[in-house]
């Protein structure tokens, strides 16, 4: 089948990379600079994506994919393969169409992207509030408060975090 | 592919009111402020306004305040302009397009524009 | 409103030559968050507008880079290295800092 296909259309033999030069007799043309063909048999180069402006090149464009892009320090990639380029805000803000706003009360965002999101309920768990969240930090729960209740063993909290390669004191 | 579609020409009578559809693909116009922008013949540009369709929340500039009224429906991706009591100072074509200050696409888009004439 | 000035208003170039269109606003287009929300359009004869540049220098895709865009506060520049033929048209600066939004009155570039 193969065969008889590629009897029948010459251009099925031209692999990606190529295009089918209809101008020269069907023989296969390497793609032209800043084009390439991801698929064997096609008639056409397809033109490489630039990344200019807030854009930047993750990959280059070669004969047989294309360029990929992503965003500058400042902008983080949106949509399908890096449609759009979105301003980083703070932590503790989100991006709103008047641009970046601090989180209301109640919620917070720990990433320089997204939305601000609800602090967790701990009551919803059964638990209690252990740490205050803020507008970069979620709450930190605790055990139930009958946990705490006298008798009870108390909670050691986590021991505060070293810098690597730093012994304690 | 993300593509704008205005509704087409009109002819009205001085007086008259109007309203223009600006309809989006690829995108959801509530994710946008979509703005509207007036081209007299041979004229320059003129900013009329933005509308966000999530809220309904608009900003006019002074000289449109009471001329321009911007609506949008995102149940249809269509943001509208409604022109009142026109002129031939409306006679134009009316653009839309979703600016924004702190998204950028890799392509920048414009509606096809839909030309107005005030005529008796 | 910021007022946007354009000159000049006509720039008649050779397919080639450079050519160079000054924007200045009333008031700087310097915003709070420290970005300048300057941008230049391109309306080629019988077309919609087109972006080419956003804040100030930053190239649209498909924008070749002939095209350069300058300048902070309330001077601002668009340079094209060497004109071509498919340049022609009026380009205009548009200001997205303040309300209203403002564009320039537009500088028309023809060929020689």
């Known amino acids: 089948f193969e065969r008889t296909r590629s009897l029948q259309d010459p251009c099925s033999n031209c692999p990606a990379g190529t295009f089918c030069d209809n101008n020269r007799n069907q023989i296969c043309s390497p793609c032209p600079p800043n084009s390439f063909s991801s698929a064997g048999g096609q008639r056409t180069c397809d033109i490489c994506r630039q990344c200019k402006g807030v854009f930047r090149t993750r990959k280059e464009c070669s004969s047989t994919s294309n360029a990929e892009c992503d965003c500058t320090p400042g902008f983080h990639c949106l949509g399908a393969g890096c449609s759009m380029c979105e301003q980083d805000c703070k932590q503790g803000q989100e991006l709103t169409k008047k641009g970046c706003k601090d989180c209301c009360f109640g919620t917070f965002n720990d990433q320089k992207r997204g939305i601000c999101r609800p602090w967790t309920n701990c009551s919803l768990d059964g638990k209690s509030v252990l740490v205050n969240g803020t507008k970069e930090r979620d709450v930190v729960c605790g055990p139930s408060p009958a946990d705490l209740s006298p008798g009870a063993s108390s909670v050691t909290p986590p021991a505060p975090a070293r810098e690597p390669g730093h012994s304690p004191q | 592919e993300v593509q704008l579609q205005q509704s087409g020409a009109e002819l009205v009578r001085p007086g008259a009111s109007v309203k223009l559809s600006c309809t989006a693909s690829?995108?959801?116009?509530?994710?946008?402020?979509m703005h509207w922008v007036k081209q007299r013949p041979e004229q320059g540009l003129e900013w009329i306004g933005r509308?966000?369709?999530?809220?309904?929340?608009?900003e006019y500039a002074p000289k449109f305040q009471g001329k321009a009224t911007m609506t949008a429906d995102t149940s249809s991706n269509t943001a509208y302009l409604q022109l009142s009591t026109l002129t031939s100072e409306d006679t134009a074509v009316y653009y839309c397009t979703p600016y924004s200050n702190y998204v950028y696409w890799y392509f920048d888009v414009w509606g096809t524009g839909t030309t107005v004439t005030v005529s008796s | 409103d910021v007022v946007m000035t354009q000159t000049p208003l006509t720039l008649s170039v050779t397919i080639g030559q450079a050519a160079s269109i000054s924007c200045k606003s009333s008031q700087s287009l310097l915003d709070s968050d420290g970005k300048t929300y300057l941008n230049w359009l391109l309306q080629r004869p019988g077309q919609s507008p087109k972006r080419l540049i956003y804040l100030v220098s930053k190239l649209d895709s498909g924008v070749p880079d002939r095209f350069t865009g300058s300048g902070s506060g309330t001077d601002f520049t668009l340079k094209i290295s060497r004109v071509e033929a498919e340049d022609l048209g009026v380009y205009y600066c548009?200001?997205?800092?303040?309300?209203?939004?403002?564009f320039g009155g537009g500088t028309k570039l023809e060929i020689k």
């Open positions: 548009w200001q997205g800092t303040h309300f209203p939004h403002t």
């Open positions: 509308i966000d369709p999530e809220d309904g929340d608009t």
């Open positions: 690829g995108f959801n116009i509530k994710d946008y402020y």
